[in-house]
């Protein structure tokens, strides 16, 4: 449980006691210079208009200099993703300074306090920086403010405060309560940076979000539409954060962001790419796998600088685990007739052959609904790199897997007993990949049977003309 | 070099309290958590806890929490562990360790405490 | 809580060959693992930390490998020294938990 000051003081003392008396407290905020990969290394605690802990611990004025910034805690300790983080900034950036911001004694309160202490915990990065700057060759451009949760908000207050502009503050998963439509001065914002990228991935439209619902930055990325994070098991936590416990599921779906980003070091020759869209649905849909005018990007570290004129949203699916990448699959079927539908959506799986590998049966999530004469658009994504696509495997279930279904084909069957077989024709499936940006069209293996119904499957070949690329742009980027 | 150095044996009755202090040296204290982790004969190590001596921020393992106290006199680079309520299945062997920077490796240890509940 | 089990729960092995011991966490615990050997009336000490990362003063011939929920500690060429009980740890969330430990002994 949170625990108060003890004898160090409450901040408010602290910033009101006269000088004399302020040298004899503790800085509530601590900076640590990580000079070694090792965890048992103490660091050197840098502090403002000290210069020799910066030449005791080889401070690298020309490199990139990452300041690392937790959030709020219940307890004194640091979490586990700290290390991993910091471990993965040295593996990627060897000469890099990486700095943790340990404002511990102000984020282990209640949440109420802590989100009041972050304005402080941002001035004081914002001095830290200011004097830096006075040092030849420190360029705040080859800053990167990386904060987590309330940290997030953290890096905006600094660098709102700072004299200048940072070169990058990455947001993971920005805290929700007190910061939801909050004014841009309050809360992360893509003026506190040159570049501002954020990663949503305990977002709820219901109950309490823990994470930041709206866009904060000049990216936005929303991986599995920035709720429900694969492998992080129950999703129905609604508890208070101020005075309660955090499960473990909320833990997992909150710091997937932190992981994401980690993922995006550790394994940059197996970069996630992220989609440009105006909403969730329509990233279901499988609408938005473009990369065209700056549409797509790498997510976490990789991520291409994109001043966009106003926020932009990007969405992608992910793994459970690392390492994250999905391959993304627009699929695209034009059902040309429809006989007896009734009340039912069909439910559809696919599977995927290709050179390297074949995929699992995948489910086509019905956003909507099935429309006729009509083309309808999915999207599919498979764990393993499937190399070029071969031939594609649609099935119709058979029998209803939902109580919902059997209800209403119960219903139906009772207005329409002698309801003849349901049907439906597909002479084509187009192909897109997200990744790739290549489009493939297939085409039914024998023309003269294009009709699926349920319990049936119905085979599609590569057509003749292959693969066509139509100048779409590759989702590959420069690595910073 | 690191020591860590606990305070001597106890034998307490059920019912009772019993606090174990850890002093260390060697080290800059208030830069490391401590924490303490207890043996019972013949069984696992159970982690009870840890402090941030820094400021004395605490987690607490649930199984202990409403039993265990972990404080700090940084004055004497001390950490003391409190067990109220003491049960038989309490006797064990209680050590303090040191953690890294992010407190989840032990790479210092005190000696142990030995701390038998009898009535 | 995440629960660490280790195996076998006695390992009997002759001084001279390699020793091999696991550690399998309940769920994924990436690389927050670190395992202690302890002897008779001793503090434990600390072999491995994060899986596979070496401690100063600790024989080479120990080594860690593994992430995620499976591990493995490796004793290349067992000394007199090295019989005892080695425990696992996991770090990656509270409360931090130990395995129940293997017993090494001389065969």
């Known amino acids: 449980s949170p625990v108060p000051f003890g004898p160090e003081g409450r901040l408010e003392d602290k910033l009101h006691k006269p000088k004399a008396t302020q040298t004899e407290v503790k800085p509530s905020v601590r900076f640590n210079l990580r000079t070694s990969k090792d965890p048992e290394h103490e660091g050197c605690y840098l502090s403002v208009g000290h210069s020799q802990p910066l030449e005791d611990c080889s401070f690298n004025m020309t490199a990139k200099t990452f300041f690392i910034i937790h959030g709020w805690t219940m307890s004194g300790i640091f979490e586990n993703w700290l290390h991993k983080l910091v471990s993965a900034l040295h593996t990627r950036e060897k000469d890099a300074n990486v700095v943790v911001v340990d404002w511990l004694p102000l984020a282990h309160q209640l949440y109420t306090d802590a989100v009041n202490n972050t304005r402080v915990v941002g001035h004081s990065i914002a001095r830290m920086l200011d004097w830096l700057q006075e040092k030849d060759d420190f360029s705040l451009g080859n800053v990167h403010l990386i904060g987590y949760s309330l940290g997030a908000h953290v890096a905006g207050y600094a660098g709102n405060f700072v004299k200048g502009t940072v070169g990058r503050i990455t947001g993971l998963d920005p805290a929700g309560p007190m910061f939801e439509g909050a004014d841009i001065h309050k809360r992360l914002s893509p003026d506190d940076a040159d570049f501002v990228d954020v990663l949503h991935t305990y977002t709820r439209s219901f109950g309490l979000s823990i994470g930041i619902q709206m866009p904060v930055g000049h990216i936005d990325i929303y991986p599995n539409g920035g709720d429900f994070q694969p492998g992080c098991g129950l999703n129905d936590v609604l508890g208070s954060i101020a005075y309660g416990t955090i499960t473990e599921v909320v833990k997992c779906e909150h710091e997937r962001a932190v992981h994401l980003f980690v993922d995006s070091l550790v394994n940059q020759d197996k970069p996630s790419f992220a989609f440009q869209c105006t909403d969730s649905n329509r990233f279901k849909k499988g609408i938005c796998l473009s990369c065209r005018k700056n549409r797509c990007n790498s997510i976490g570290y990789n991520a291409k600088k994109m001043r966009n004129k106003r926020n932009s949203k990007m969405y992608l699916k992910t793994r459970a685990g690392m390492p994250f990448r999905v391959y993304h699959y627009q699929m695209k079927i034009h059902v040309f007739s429809y006989k007896n539908m009734g009340e039912i959506e069909p439910t559809f799986y696919v599977t995927l052959y290709g050179t390297n590998a074949d995929s699992q049966t995948l489910p086509l999530e019905i956003v909507e609904r099935i429309e006729q004469n009509a083309t309808n658009t999915f999207l599919v994504y498979t764990e393993e790199d499937l190399g070029d696509l071969l031939k594609i495997q649609l099935t119709w279930e058979g029998a209803s897997q939902s109580w919902y279904n059997l209800w209403k084909e119960f219903r139906s069957y009772l207005s329409q007993p002698r309801n003849p077989g349901r049907e439906l024709n597909i002479r084509r499936i187009r192909v897109k990949s997200g990744e790739t940006q290549r489009k493939l069209t297939f085409c039914t293996e024998d023309p003269e049977n294009t009709s699926i119904s349920p319990g049936r499957e119905l085979w599609f070949r590569k057509c003749r003309d292959g693969w066509r690329m139509k100048n779409e742009t590759s989702p590959t980027v420069e690595l910073p | 070099q690191v020591q860590l150095v606990q305070s001597g044996a106890e034998v307490k009755k059920p019912g009772a309290s019993v606090k174990v202090s850890c002093k260390a040296s060697g080290y800059t204290f208030t830069d490391y958590t401590m924490h303490w982790v207890r043996q019972a004969p013949g069984q696992r190590l159970e982690w009870m806890g840890g402090?941030?001596?820094?400021?004395?921020?605490?987690t607490y393992n649930e199984k202990f929490k409403d039993r265990v106290t972990i404080t700090r006199d940084t004055s004497a680079s001390t950490a003391y562990m409190e067990l109220s309520s003491l049960r038989s299945e309490d006797t064990a062997v209680y050590y303090c360790a040191r953690g890294d920077y992010y407190g989840g490796s032990y790479n210092y240890w005190g000696q142990g405490t030995t701390v038998t509940v009898s009535s | 809580e995440i629960v660490m089990t280790q195996s076998p729960a006695t390992l009997s092995v002759s001084p001279g060959e390699r020793a091999t011991l696991s550690c399998r966490a309940s769920q994924d615990i990436s690389n927050s693992l670190h395992w202690y050997q302890q002897k008779p009336g001793q503090a434990p000490r600390l072999l491995i930390k994060y899986a596979s990362q070496s401690i100063s003063g600790i024989p080479a011939r120990f080594s860690g490998s593994g992430s995620g929920t499976e591990f493995t500690l490796t004793i290349s060429s067992l000394q007199s020294e090295d019989f005892a009980v080695y425990y696992c740890q996991q770090s990656n969330s509270w409360p931090y938990t130990f395995g129940q430990g293997t017993k090494l002994e001389i065969k």
């Open positions: 402090i941030n001596p820094y400021y004395g921020g605490t």
